[in-house]
């Protein structure tokens, strides 16, 4: 795995990796602002549970299909996948904020982006999302909810915004009239939608429509919930690649220097090179690091 910008240069020298030649394709209540000195319960350190630990600026929304197309046992597997993913994210109001929504003919938010709870508590809440087993799970309704409720106001413009749409069913056509409009609305707000189709009844037509709306909207199509665990690392890695590192704290003018910071080009501050499970956690916010890169096949 590549650990810095400098490594991309090295990779470029070894082999020319391109997919395109030049000339080719041309809602919780609002909170008071967080002061840097305020300590919240979620800031109390909980050690990383895995080698892969995504320390990025990211607002991530999990959208869980609550239809009867998933049995109750399969829904438990889906929740376990969400909890597993949450274990690999540096969840806090400063780094990765998460929301968890179960959708049926409406939407039920269990966790909001601004909820100030310890990561372990948020994982507990996610594990207790109730199985709805409804006849309908409306992707249009949940995307509308994501657009107008969760991302109605962009309060962290520096963070990437991603909706992970876990879908196992097809909504009736009458409900999907405004589907594309909502996906386009999310794109306008720079929200990336990542559909994860699960099982034989997932709406492939909608998945392809989502992919068509924005090049960042990468879909994952799985034959059953049993494949979620296999795909988890790839999904979380893709999400993390889309999110920026924290910018270094700004220095007062008299302290500002024009020298290159140690974490920029030097390898010494980047921590260990990462193997299959990349370690995205930096212990010091001032160490600037660009994400690992898997060499293109």
């Amino acid at each position: 795995e590549r650990g810095s910008l400098n490594d991309i240069f090295e990779a470029q020298k070894i082999e020319w990796h391109t997919s395109q030649e030049p000339g080719g394709l041309v809602v919780p209540p609002t909170d008071a602002p967080v002061s840097p000195t305020t300590l919240y319960v979620e800031d109390i350190s909980e050690p990383p549970l895995h080698d892969f630990y995504c320390s990025r600026l990211l607002d991530l929304v999990f959208l869980l299909d609550g239809s009867s197309r998933l049995s109750e046992a399969e829904f438990e597997v889906l929740k376990a996948f969400v909890v597993d993913m949450m274990e690999r994210l540096r969840i806090s109001q400063k780094w990765v904020r998460v929301a968890v929504v179960e959708y049926h003919d409406g939407s039920h938010a269990y966790i909001g982006l601004k909820d100030r709870k310890r990561p372990s508590e948020l994982r507990r809440i996610a594990s207790q999302v109730k199985y709805a087993g409804s006849q309908v799970a409306s992707t249009s309704e949940v995307l509308k909810y994501t657009l107008f409720q969760i991302f109605s106001k962009i309060d962290r413009p520096e963070a990437s915004r991603i909706a992970l749409l876990l879908m196992a069913s097809q909504e009736p056509q009458r409900m999907s009239r405004n589907f594309v409009r909502y996906v386009q609305g999310l794109k306008k707000k720079k929200v990336i939608v990542i559909p994860v189709g699960i099982g034989p009844h997932a709406n492939l037509k909608q998945i392809r429509l989502i992919e068509k709306q924005a090049p960042e909207n990468k879909a994952f199509v799985l034959s059953s919930v049993d494949e979620l665990e296999q795909q988890r690392d790839e999904i979380v890695s893709y999400l993390c690649d889309l999110a920026p590192e924290a910018p270094p704290p700004t220095l007062p003018p008299d302290m500002a220097q024009v020298t290159v910071g140690p974490g920029l080009l030097g390898v010494s501050t980047l921590g260990p090179k990462r193997n299959h499970h990349h370690h995205h956690h930096h212990h010091h916010a001032h160490i600037v690091m660009v994400d690992a890169y898997k060499p293109t096949k």
């Epitope: 991309i8 720079k190 924005a214 910018p247 270094p248 920029l264």
Partner: nanobody, 117 residues
């Protein structure tokens, strides 16, 4: 429709400066690492400068370090390359490119930079 459009190239004397711009559309710009490449006839494209998503990290090819500066404006979906103390060997077609995850996904058409001695 994804587009990357470079501008700012031209003819300049050795020791002079140029500022290249690359305006993008059709992508969520802030989730792409951006790079500037250059290519001269018969040679492989060379990665010249690279900038991270937020713009807080940059890196450069040894041949341009201290002379070139890459920057980005995420509000305007644009990346820049400030080229100072230009040398005849900097003559090339300069391309901007957008990197998502592990691959360079999108490319501009290129802009010619010619440095005369």
């Amino acid at each position: 429709q994804v587009q990357l459009v470079e501008s700012g190239g031209g003819l300049v004397q050795a020791g002079g400066s140029l500022r290249l711009s690359c305006a993008t559309s059709g992508i969520i710009f802030s989730v792409y690492h951006m790079g500037w490449f250059r290519q001269t006839p018969g040679k492989e494209r060379e990665l010249v400068a690279l900038i991270s998503l937020s713009g807080s990290s940059t890196d450069y090819a040894d041949s341009v370090k201290g002379r070139f500066a890459i920057s980005r404006d995420n509000a305007k979906d644009t990346v820049f390359l400030q080229m100072n103390t230009l040398k005849p060997e900097d003559t090339a077609v300069y391309y901007c490119a957008a990197r998502l995850g592990s691959s360079w996904k999108y490319w501009g058409q290129g802009t010619q930079v010619t440095v005369s001695s």
